[in-house]
């Protein structure tokens, strides 16, 4: 068997650090056997069998010119093996951040804080942080650690499924290369890293007969789970074309009627979502949707939701009471906020 421990990485490659002494090991001989060393492609002897170093070649203060392939051979000239030297640095602690788009799962991403120049892999795990007793920090089996499954195709990301919203987790990301390992521990709570995906399906429609109104509607992001315990609240922004400033409102549901649109101008509208109890942060804004208030009068046949309206020919004044909010079919995944609060109280 080879006297050379195989470092993690491609076979036949050995590793060292620039500026440090590097030992290369001849793989095809018995430990301690005297060998001769050559640089591949150069006939001059680098180190003879009488060096007293056995099967090892010592390069003092290695630098980039020492990188390359070396040949070792036995006393009678048989090939002992070829070894490629690659120089680089031990791992440094990776930079890690975690984010959650819903209250059941979260993902963590990482990047090297220093480039090692060597083949590198990452070990990812997590455990739930719980204290079993006032004076005990012992881990129970239910707290892990468990592997954090990494995305395929080498994306620097792992995902924890089925996390508990009220628990704290400790994420372990260890950078490993042939010269060592370095670990970053990150404590996360779902509540603090929760950032929903932006709402989907934003539509902006004119309200017939109301030249200063626009009706915006949207749906929950597909990534938000269907259970009703955690609702989202929304923030809507709108502005007329070429207008630099956004107006902001906080709708109560999945739609909003804008009553102060500028007649005749297209308007940009966008929405953002957040956990309704203010956990985490607001989502990014949805893609903008555009709509232009209607210009004509209200039609003879009016939509069902407009049946309560009198039939004004002109837009009411801004200070007039707004018409009743259209009644929506409840979102299949939604309860009224008050219901949710009551449920949270029961859960607590």
């Amino acid at each position: 068997s080879s006297p050379c421990p195989q470092a993690w990485g491609p076979p036949g490659v050995q590793y060292g650090q620039p500026g440090r002494s590097v030992k290369l090991c001849c793989p095809g001989v018995t430990a301690g056997d005297p060998v001769s060393w050559f640089r591949d492609g150069e006939p001059k002897l680098l180190q003879g069998p009488d060096s007293g170093l056995g099967h090892e070649l010592v390069l003092a203060q290695a630098d980039s010119t020492d990188e390359g392939t070396y040949i070792c051979q036995t006393l009678d000239g048989a090939l002992g093996g070829t070894v490629t030297l690659q120089l680089g640095y031990p791992p440094a602690r990776p930079v890690v951040s975690c984010q959650a788009a819903d209250y059941e799962n979260f993902s963590c991403t990482w990047s090297p804080s220093q480039i090692s120049g060597l083949p590198t892999r990452y070990l990812t795990s997590y455990r739930k942080k719980t204290v079993l007793g006032a004076d005990s920090q012992r881990r129970s089996p239910s707290t892990g650690p468990w592997p954090c499954p990494q995305d395929p195709l080498g994306a620097a990301r792992c995902v924890v499924h089925g996390a508990e919203f009220w628990s704290q987790y400790r994420i372990n990301v260890t950078e490993v290369n042939p010269l060592g390992a370095s670990t970053r521990l990150l404590d996360v709570s779902l509540q603090s890293i929760l950032r929903p995906d932006p709402p989907q399906g934003l539509r902006v429609e004119s309200v017939p007969g109301y030249p200063r109104r626009l009706r915006a509607s949207w749906t929950y992001p597909a990534s938000w789970p269907c259970q009703p315990h955690f609702l989202l609240k929304f923030r809507l922004q709108y502005r007329p074309a070429q207008h630099p400033a956004w107006s902001t409102v906080e709708p109560a549901g999945l739609e909003e009627v804008i009553t102060d649109a500028v007649a005749g101008l297209p308007h940009a509208v966008r929405v953002s979502a957040r956990d309704f109890l203010d956990a985490g942060t607001w989502s990014t804004w949805s893609p903008e949707a555009w709509g232009t208030p209607s210009t004509g009068t209200i039609p003879k046949e009016i939509p069902a939701w407009g049946q309560l309206h009198t039939q004004p020919e002109v837009e009411p004044q801004v200070d007039s009471p707004a018409p009743p909010r259209p009644s929506l079919q409840p979102h299949p995944r939604l309860l009224d906020h008050r219901d949710s609060v009551e449920q949270v109280a029961v859960l607590a």
């Epitope: 150069e42 006939p43 001059k44 002897l45 040949i71 009678d76 000239g77 048989a78």
Partner: antibody
């Protein structure tokens, strides 16, 4: 014991090619380099090149590199050296030699190649 | 290419005498210098490697010395079978090259 047995003498016309073989026995063929050298009549030794034991990687003397090809057949433990575009000054005894990377420890008996019109 | 110059071209000595053969390199080659013996009609035989390292099976009367550019092969007491042509060879850089040879003949 180590033996290198070369093919027989050849007579070639100028411009032709010659392929000399060297059959090895008595050792693990893929553990050692094979070198090719030549010796012109009454002259010294000239190194043509070598071929690696396991990967068939070659180092050729620049003087011959456009005309020489070294190969091995591992299944028969035989090395080959082909020299093309022969001229009269290529008349020589051609040797294969088992060695390490740069030394010649065991030699074949030699193959006389005569280039004559 | 590194040029090796051997001297003398011919050395005439009697059995029992001490022979000193010289090889000079056109540039410093450290100790990457080797010696071969060739008898008429035979292939060469490796005598000394890396300037001074002995080879298994070679009589102890053969020794080598030198480093850099100047090298010496010494035969301490000539035997009749030692009369042959001796070549030095360098392995410091490609191509591997030989000296032109020193012919050791019986006086």
């Amino acid at each position: 014991q180590v033996q290198l047995v070369q093919s027989g003498a050849e007579v070639k016309k100028p411009g032709a090619s010659v392929k000399v073989s060297c059959k090895a026995s008595g050792y693990t063929f893929t553990n050692y380099w094979m070198h090719w050298l030549r010796q012109r009549p009454g002259q010294g030794l000239e190194w043509i090149g070598n071929i690696g034991p396991s990967d068939s990687k070659t180092h050729y003397n620049q003087k011959f590199k456009d005309r020489v090809t070294m190969t091995v057949d591992k299944s028969t433990s035989t090395a080959y050296m082909e020299l093309s575009s022969l001229r009269s000054e290529d008349t020589a005894v051609y040797y294969c030699a088992r060695g390490d990377y740069v030394l010649f420890t065991y030699w074949g008996q030699g193959t006389l190649v005569t280039v004559s019109s | 290419d590194i040029v090796l110059t051997q001297s003398p071209a011919t050395l005439s000595l009697s059995p029992g005498e001490r022979a000193t053969l010289s090889c000079r390199a056109s540039q410093s080659i450290s100790n990457n210098l080797h010696w071969y013996q060739q008898k008429p009609g035979q292939a060469p035989r490796l005598l000394i490697k890396y300037a001074s390292q002995s080879i298994s099976g070679i009589p102890a009367r053969f020794s080598g010395s030198g480093s850099g550019t100047d090298f010496t092969l010494t035969i301490s007491s000539l035997e009749p079978e030692d009369f042959a042509v001796y070549y030095c060879q360098q392995s410091y850089s490609w191509p591997l090259t030989f000296g032109q040879g020193t012919k050791l003949e019986i006086k």
